[in-house]
């Protein structure tokens, strides 16, 4: 007769692993008992279990309530057992030793090996600015048995830098993900990957990137500066910009306080019907977190029955 | 015939030594673990000691651990008890039996049990 | 310590009567289980190993039953001979353990 075996049996941490020893004897031959064992290099063999054709399954103190035999209908020449909810500690090399009768004894060997799927985790690095040069994004860490396979998948053009940490049983696996920030990258997501023999599918942790930026400031609203005349009402300036985080928006006149009657509503300033002492120095003061940035106008409020029009100067200062 | 024949009882003070043996015969005697088992007056069975067939590993109860010391002369197919530090509690027949180490730590039932021999320990 | 509960300690029958005897270990020891007759200045017999198989030489009168934690010793016609004390013993851990004995007495 011969044992049959698995030369490796691969289980996923928690899971039950099925350690395979059948006898393909010839016909009247009996199986005894078959004792199991591990049998780790350089360690004496540590009793797992025995099953005996008369007294049953013998279970050694150290894997109590661990391991049993497959159930029901079992052949008497099967001397596979289970080993219950495996843990990282039980990869290694274990031994049937089938006492068989009239044939002898017979012994075979296998690898154990507890596939440890990683939790992956993903860090965003520091707060991104536009301005910055090569800037740590996110870095993602996984860590398993074997080691995993870490990704990134993104639109964003960077680069992408590993390394790789061995433990006793495992290996931690760190990349990070590095560019220069601009504000086309606002909102844009950066999706680490990682890989693993112990996962039936890829973990995907998205992290979505904000980059501080604040755009120059510009006023709408005299466009058409005949429309700026004594006695004309819903005239309006328009402060235009554009940040992240959104920016707030204060209004000032440069040549004294706000005309009494005109109302601050966020980036519009709206005037109550035009006077000439709504003539003046006005300024959009535009900030953020990440910056400030001011842009000024000259509003000038025609009289009709002056026949000459009046120039308009626009300046924008950061 | 497996046959087992203790000796070496008799009555002894509180503190005193005592070697029992148990003499082997009829069967391979280094092929088998040996355990001691006691009896005392008008009691139950109460295990005390066994040996692996090759001395490697002893076992105690409790009970006797650090005073009893088993051993056994597989050349001349004898079992031994030695007793120190007896004690009152200590009074029992003890007998000799014989299993079959399967695999590990793990013994067949003792199919084979000598006659006895009484121990008393008495002031 | 695996602990053997024997029930009932003792007993009173007839020749010919069926006997029961139980014995409940505090934890699974599959059938690593043995039963042992004695009888007064005499050294214990083993009637039955690994639960439920008789040793050789004992009569069939003699069964036994149960694995894990419930066993039973039967004796189904009682004879003269087989008025003695009965032990249950677990030889699944050691300590190996032993009942406390149950003792047949007639009737």
């Known amino acids: 007769g011969e044992l049959e075996t698995s030369d490796v049996v691969t289980v996923v941490l928690g899971q039950d692993a099925k350690l395979p020893c059948f006898y393909r004897g010839d016909s009247g031959e009996q199986v005894g008992q078959v004792a199991w064992a591990r049998v780790d290099a350089g360690e004496g063999a540590q009793e797992l279990a025995l099953l005996h054709s008369k007294y049953g399954l013998h279970v050694s103190p150290a894997y109590e309530g661990r391991v049993e035999q497959p159930p029901p209908p079992r052949n008497p020449l099967d001397g596979s057992v289970l080993l219950r909810n495996a843990v990282q500690a039980d990869e290694g090399e274990y031994e049937c030793r089938v006492s068989t009768f009239p044939a002898g004894s017979f012994q075979a060997r296998l690898r154990l090996r507890v596939l440890v799927p990683p939790l992956p985790s993903l860090n965003p690095g520091p707060a991104l600015e536009e301005g910055q040069g090569l800037t740590l994004a996110a870095s993602c860490t996984a860590e398993g048995s074997p080691a995993p396979s870490v990704t990134w998948d993104t639109e964003v053009k960077g680069t992408t830098s590993s390394r790789s940490f061995k433990h006793s049983r495992s290996a931690a696996v760190t990349s990070e993900f590095h560019l220069v920030p601009s504000r086309s990258m606002n909102g844009q997501p950066l999706t680490c990957v990682v890989s693993h023999p112990g996962l039936l599918q890829d973990q995907r942790i998205t992290h979505i990137l904000h980059v501080s930026f604040l755009a120059e400031a510009s006023v709408r609203g005299l466009e058409d500066q005949n429309l700026w005349h004594i006695g004309r009402e819903g005239a309006m300036l328009k402060c235009l910009s554009e940040g992240q985080p959104p920016p707030s928006y204060n209004w000032t006149r440069l040549d004294g306080p706000l005309p009494s009657g005109v109302r601050v509503d966020g980036d519009t300033l709206g005037f109550p019907p035009l006077t000439t002492e709504h003539s003046g120095i006005y300024v959009c003061h535009v900030s953020n977190e990440f910056s400030s940035r001011d842009s000024q106008v000259t509003v000038d409020v025609l009289d009709p029955q002056e026949d000459s029009g009046k120039q308009v100067d626009l300046v924008s200062a950061s | 015939e497996v046959q087992l024949v203790e000796s070496g009882g008799g009555l002894v003070q509180p503190g005193g030594s005592l070697r029992l043996s148990c003499a082997a015969s009829?069967?391979?005697?280094?092929?088998?673990?040996m355990s001691w088992v006691r009896q005392a007056p008008g009691k139950g069975l109460e295990w005390v000691s066994g040996?692996?067939?090759?001395?490697?590993?002893?076992y105690y109860a409790d009970s006797v651990k650090g005073r009893f010391t088993i051993s056994r002369d597989n050349s001349k197919n004898t079992l031994y008890l030695q007793m120190n530090s007896l004690r009152a509690e200590d009074t029992a027949v003890y007998y000799c039996?014989?299993?079959?180490?399967?695999?590990?730590?793990?013994?067949?039932?003792?199919?084979?049990w000598g006659q006895g021999t009484l121990v008393t320990v008495s002031s | 310590d695996i602990q053997m509960t024997q029930s009932p300690s003792s007993l009173s029958a007839s020749v010919g009567d069926r006997v029961t005897i139980t014995c409940r270990a505090s934890?699974?020891?599959?059938?690593?289980l043995a039963w042992y007759q004695q009888k007064p200045g005499k050294a214990p017999k083993l009637l039955i190993y690994a639960a439920s198989s008789l040793q050789s030489g004992v009569p069939s009168r003699f069964s036994g039953s149960g694995s894990g934690t419930d066993f039973t010793l039967t004796i189904s016609s009682l004879q003269p001979e087989d008025f003695a004390t009965y032990y249950c013993?677990?030889?699944?851990?050691?300590?190996?353990?032993f009942g406390q004995g149950t003792k047949v007495e007639i009737k």
């Open positions: 934890q699974g020891i599959s059938s690593y």
């Open positions: 009829g069967y391979n005697f280094d092929n088998y673990a």
């Open positions: 013993q677990q030889h699944y851990t050691t300590p190996p353990t």
């Open positions: 040996i692996k067939p090759d001395s490697a590993t002893t």
């Open positions: 039996a014989r299993a079959e180490l399967l695999a590990f730590d793990v013994y067949t039932a003792s199919d084979y």
